[in-house]
Amino acid sequence: SGPVKELVGSVGGAVTFPLKSKVKQVDSIVWTFNTTPLVTIQPEGGTIIVTQNRNRERVDFPDGGYSLKLSKLKKNDSGIYYVGIYSSSLQQPSTQEYVLHVYEHLSKPKVTMGLQSNKNGTCVTNLTCCMEHGEEDVIYTWKALGQAANESHNGSILPISWRWGESDMTFICVARNPVSRNFSSPILARKLCEGAADDPDSSMV
């Protein structure tokens, strides 16, 4: 019985729960998901019983080994998986626990602009990056391109201060989660500062 294994999968994808055993006579292998039985295998009997019929097409055993592959992942497959290997040659079952996190592939992040001020030829505002569907575990970074050195900024909010007459700048929000990343449409400082002069709470995609 080893430490808990953390696994990551993406919606629609597949994940393999690794399992090895050198036990000669395995009587049964029982997989459970959040305490609900998932699959029972009797290697000697040659039988594999998937508790819920709808999971049958999603369950596989790569190369005929003990590892369990779960396909067509859904968000609600996230949770705790537990396997027990039962054998008359073992005093107690050999066990392993896994935690699976299933993430969605990120759509294009949306950018909104906060209140803007134009003072002394300087345009000052905040750009906020967010996911429309409230996806979990998203990390945001901003790329600012166009000045002598390209800059990066961590976090969903990017404070902007751009002087009229300076070379134009391009801002791009990058949204990342453990399985994917996506980019906002590029935003030009000149356009942003022009278009926002008369609409202080505008938003852009």
């Epitope: 055993s21 000669k24 000697e44 009997g45 040659g46 039988t47 594999i48």
Partner: antibody, heavy 120, light 108 residues
Framework: QVQLVQSGAEVKKPGASVKVSCKAS????????MNWVRQAPGQCLEWIGR????????KYNAKFKGKATLTADKSTSTAYMELSSLRSEDTAVYYC?????????????WGQGTLVTVSS | DIQMTQSPSSLSASVGDRVTITCKAS??????VAWYQQKPGKAPKLLIY???YRYTGVPDRFTGSGSGTDFTLTISSLQPEDFATYYC??????????FGCGTKVEIK
């Protein structure tokens, strides 16, 4: 990758013995069952028996008890099948085949086969 | 010993055809049936185990089904490389494991 390589064809006289070898590579030889299967000309496939190299435990089809002896050498990852008191009806291709872990009676990797011809 | 009766013993089909091979066990073997493909001069190749589990790398046009005593191997759309002999095998509990006598799939 998993490979099972068997010894070459043999021609034997009735009453003689023959020992066929099967060298395994690419997996944990000691902890997988190794099966032996016979295919005689125009006959169905027949399961002879299997051996667990880890402890040399062998199980036989009753039909082949006394005819076949299965052994394994862990140090060279080689399984052997010896056939004794050969008769013309023992003429066949003999295969070694590894058991899958998840269903030990299903065989996923096979040797290329060894033709044993028994003829006077 | 458990007998495995396979039918038909041979069949002729064309590329693209749907082909069904059946296997009947002489007693209940639960879902412990494997299917193999064999080409002349070659060793058998595992296609399906535990009645319906496709072995890694086997194309999804091969489907196994059944439980108890009646089992089926279906090839949904026959490809040129599928012309071969197919064997069922029961791998239920205590050996001996037994095979059907094969179905030869030939070109029509």
């Amino acid at each position: 990758q998993v490979q099972l390589v068997q010894s070459g064809a043999e021609v034997k006289k009735p009453g003689a013995s023959v020992k066929v070898s099967c060298k395994a590579s690419g997996y944990a030889f000691s902890s997988s069952w190794m099966n032996w299967v016979r295919q005689a000309p125009g006959q169905c496939l027949e399961w002879i028996g299997r051996i667990y190299p880890g402890d040399a435990d062998a199980k036989y089809n009753a039909k082949f008890k006394g005819k076949a002896t299965l052994t394994a050498d862990k140090s060279t990852s080689t399984a052997y099948m010896e056939l004794s008191s050969l008769r013309s009806e023992d003429t066949a291709v003999y295969y070694c085949a590894r058991s899958t872990m998840i269903a030990t009676g299903a065989m996923d990797y096979w040797g290329q086969g060894t033709l044993v011809t028994v003829s006077s | 010993d458990i007998q495995m009766t396979q039918s038909p013993s041979s069949l002729s089909a064309s590329v693209g055809d749907r082909v069904t091979i059946t296997c009947k066990a002489s007693q209940d073997v639960s879902t412990a049936v494997a299917w193999y493909q064999q080409k002349p001069g070659k060793a058998p190749k595992l296609l399906i185990y535990s009645a319906s589990y496709r072995y890694t790398g086997v194309p999804d046009r091969f489907t196994g089904s059944g439980s108890g005593t009646d089992f089926t191997l279906t090839i949904s759309s026959l490809q040129p490389e599928d012309f071969a002999t197919y064997y069922c095998q029961q791998h239920y509990s205590t050996p001996p494991y037994t095979f059907g006598c094969g179905t030869k799939v030939e070109i029509k």
